[in-house]
Interface confidence: medium
């Protein structure tokens, strides 16, 4: 059954800079990935990046660099400066649209005990919405 994992890491070199990595564990072909913060996209969250396998990538501040890592995983680096910068307890969500199954979403945040540069392993997070 499809699942989504989310990993959040604070960069050791820039303490207010975050890297979010998300992956899809499923057999369907990915049509779209949406990364948001503050909650699920469409349910109070704010979109940070949209990645489409063919149409390209769009990102919005404070997102600095969104990219595909593999055919089924992405990473997003966030700038840490300014009023819109994330804090340690910010929730980040990734939604994978997989054809033809539908939409699979999971959220994660920085592990409470993690030191800069460290993070929890990328384990599957709870799926919030799926079809």
């Amino acid at each position: 059954t499809p699942e989504v994992w989310v990993q959040v890491r604070m960069e050791a070199t820039e303490l207010s800079s975050f890297t979010i990595r998300c992956g899809f564990l499923g057999s369907g072909s990915i049509s779209l990935v949406t990364v948001s913060w503050g909650g699920p996209n469409g349910a109070g969250g704010t979109t940070l990046a949209v990645l489409h396998p063919e149409r390209g990538i769009r990102q919005w501040a404070p997102a600095r660099q969104a990219r595909w890592e593999t055919q089924s995983s992405i990473s997003l680096i966030l700038e840490g400066s300014g009023a819109s910068s994330p804090c340690a307890n910010t929730t980040f969500c990734c939604k994978f649209a997989s054809f033809p199954e539908g939409s699979w979403e999971a959220c994660g945040s920085l592990p409470p005990s993690s030191d800069p540069g460290l993070s929890a392993p990328p384990t599957p997070a709870p799926i919030l919405r799926a079809d």
């Epitope: 059954t1 649209a97 199954e101 799926i127 799926a130 079809d131």
Partner: antibody, heavy 122, light 106 residues
């Protein structure tokens, strides 16, 4: 107003093919997938397959693989479902449904065609 | 494929009563969706992703469950609720529907 309008009823002989159309209006055609469901008389619902209208990807129920073909014409916002090698047990009402929008969080099937009755009889 | 078994096949109740419809999956699914169908009409989505009310669906409908066991509940039946109800899974291909529960007036 969002609408899916399907072609009219068909009577076919065993071994023939049928092509049912589903014309969409009232929304951006390529934003949504279309899926097809059929319902034999007095029976339940059966998923036949899904087509991604933006890039023509298809996913078929293995039960129909080799017999079903789903296509789309973006110029007319129409999706087609063709079923070949018809047999009597293919007699059913065939529905198209609007399935998924990439900019909305949840993939809800919220609009359906009115259904097309296909009768297979010798 | 994942077989969905709905129970009961027929449920006879009176308006104002509470209806509980069950859907059991042959193997675990992440979410269940529920459709209502009236004679001569296309199906209508009621509940998506187990517990989310589709647009325009009255609040008397609710869904719950996880794993292999899912439930659709109608808290107080209205005359227009008497119809056939189908569950559907989209966790595994091919997508499958239950055989339906017919909710009839007692």
């Amino acid at each position: 107003e969002v609408q899916l309008v399907q072609s009219g009823a068909e009577v076919k002989k065993p071994g023939a093919s049928v092509k049912v159309s589903c014309k969409a209006s009232g929304y951006t055609f390529t934003d949504y997938w279309i899926y097809w469901v059929r319902q034999a008389p007095g029976q339940g619902l059966e998923w036949m397959g899904t087509i991604d209208t933006s890039d023509h990807k298809t996913s078929y129920n293995q039960k129909f693989r080799g017999r079903v073909t789903m296509t789309r014409d973006t110029s007319t916002s129409t999706v087609y479902m063709e079923l070949s090698s018809l047999r009597s047990e293919d007699t059913a009402v065939y529905y198209c449904a609007r399935d998924f929008i990439i900019t909305v969080n949840y993939p809800v099937v919220d609009y359906w065609g009115q259904g097309t009755l296909v009768t297979v009889s010798s | 494929q994942i077989v969905l078994t709905q129970s009961p096949a027929t449920l006879s109740l009176s308006p104002g009563e509470r209806a509980t419809l069950s859907c059991s999956a042959g193997s675990s699914v992440n979410y269940m969706h529920w459709f209502q169908q009236k004679p001569g009409q296309a199906p209508r989505l009621l509940i998506y992703s187990t517990s989310n009310l589709a647009s325009g669906v009255p609040a008397r409908f609710s869904g719950s469950g996880s794993g292999t066991d899912y439930t659709l509940t109608i808290s107080s039946l209205e005359p227009e609720d008497f119809a056939v109800y189908y569950c559907q899974q989209r966790s595994s291909l091919p997508f499958t529907f239950g055989q339906g529960t017919k909710l009839e007036i007692k």
